[in-house]
């Protein structure tokens, strides 16, 4: 189970993980105390044939070709959390692990 | 964490789980002894706005809008295994639990 890594200048057409730094301040998300920025990454690219298909199911659906199925797409297949310090809705400061904030691997599903 | 369920004739435009029966015999996959058919389901539909987004990361990437990011797509967010009896590459009969063969829920990621 592997995935491609690319940089922002890559001409790779296939499904790949690209670097992306999310800047909460730039978004105006002022309820986030820390981090102000973090490396989130994202997935982009084509999912042709059986390249990087995470599940056998993806291949089976492609074979069956039901109505309206648009084929597999490039999406996170492994993600990890980050620790964050933030205000909740009651203005309390919370320190917690927020799941699925970083893309570790991309694939076709 | 929920997902929409649709039938195969539905005109629902949003990301939805549709029924799909996979027939291994019809595919010519004769190395599979049992089951010959199973209910696999599949995901189809549009992922607009923040509808059914599984991860906060999906929304963040949409906000950041990096080059080449195609927006979230409708993909399995919960899958389950099935038990299968099949021939392996050495012509041995194997009974095992094959992961991620059934789509239980669809979402946008």
């Amino acid at each position: 189970d592997f995935g491609l890594d690319c940089d922002e200048h890559s001409t790779e057409s296939r499904c790949c993980r690209y670097p992306l730094t999310v800047d909460f301040e730039a978004f105006g998300w002022d309820w986030i105390i820390a981090p102000k920025r973090y490396k989130a990454n994202y997935c982009s690219g084509e999912c042709e044939f059986v390249f990087l298909q995470k599940y056998p199911h993806t291949h089976l659906v492609h074979q069956a070709n039901p109505r309206g199925s648009a084929g597999p797409c490039c999406t996170p297949t492994k993600m990890s959390p980050i620790n964050m310090l933030y205000f909740n809705g009651k203005e309390q400061i919370i320190y917690g692990k927020i799941p699925a904030m970083v893309v570790d691997r991309c694939g076709c599903s | 964490d929920f997902g929409l369920d649709c039938d195969e004739h539905s005109t629902e435009s949003r990301c939805c789980r549709y029924p799909l029966t996979v027939d291994f015999e019809a595919f010519g996959w004769d190395w599979i002894i049992a089951p010959k058919r199973y209910k696999a389901n599949y995901c189809s539909g549009e992922c607009e706005f923040v509808f059914l987004q599984k991860y906060p990361h999906t929304h963040l990437v949409h906000q950041a809008n990096p080059r080449g990011s195609a927006g979230p797509c409708c993909t399995p967010t919960k899958m389950s295994p099935i038990n299968m009896l099949y021939f392996n590459g050495k012509e041995q009969i194997i009974y095992g639990k094959i992961p991620a063969m059934v789509v239980d829920r669809c979402g946008c990621s």
């Epitope: 109505r67 309206g68 648009a70 | 004739h9 539905s10 005109t11 539909g45």
Partner: antibody, heavy 122, light 107 residues
Framework: EVQLLESGGGLIQPGGSLRLSCAAS????????MSWVRQAPGKGLEWVST????????FYADSVKGRFTISRDNSKNTLYLQMNSLRAEDTAVYYC???????????????WGQGTMVTVSS | EIVMTQSPATLSVSPGERATLSCRAS??????LAWYQQKPGQAPRLLIY???TRATGFPARFSGSGSGTEFTLTISSLQSEDFAIYYC?????????FGGGTKVEIK
Amino acid sequence: EVQLLESGGGLIQPGGSLRLSCAASGFTFSSFAMSWVRQAPGKGLEWVSTISGSGGYTFYADSVKGRFTISRDNSKNTLYLQMNSLRAEDTAVYYCAKDGRYNWNYGAFDIWGQGTMVTVSS
Amino acid sequence: EIVMTQSPATLSVSPGERATLSCRASQSVSSNLAWYQQKPGQAPRLLIYGASTRATGFPARFSGSGSGTEFTLTISSLQSEDFAIYYCQQYNNWPLTFGGGTKVEIK
């Protein structure tokens, strides 16, 4: 003003091909599903095909499946219908129609073009 | 496919009178039903969507009702510009299907 303008109709022999175009203006084209609906002379309305806003999903009536292909170019605000293996029964006025997006279902058409006539005859 | 049946095929009404048009679906379409008005030589115009919501540009004398399989379009007091063909259409299931139309003509 929201407008749809079809073109590409004409007289064609059975078995021939034709491509219809529909130029859209006055709305964010890529945000709306688009459809083709036809009307044979003196008859009622018949849905032909629908394509989602992104172009990722397409749907066809059984009567045209495998012969007609719907597509769109969102950069040009244009909808297309490629019609192959044309038959006499395909003779009709072809309307391009915009989805109203009144709920989450495809298929209620709030804006229609003026139509383009396709005649299949030898 | 869902078959949409409209009745009557032709309705002869005097100006100022009430017109009631019926549309029946062969199976439930929930409230995913539209009505269109078509005049000779023109494209159809969306009149009602969601079974009962009037589209922009049509006056309050037009009203739609029903859900499931039985639907009605009512024109409370017919004006000269209302004489046309009216089609119902379901958009609950593929394929999308239209009724055969009701022609509202001057009596």
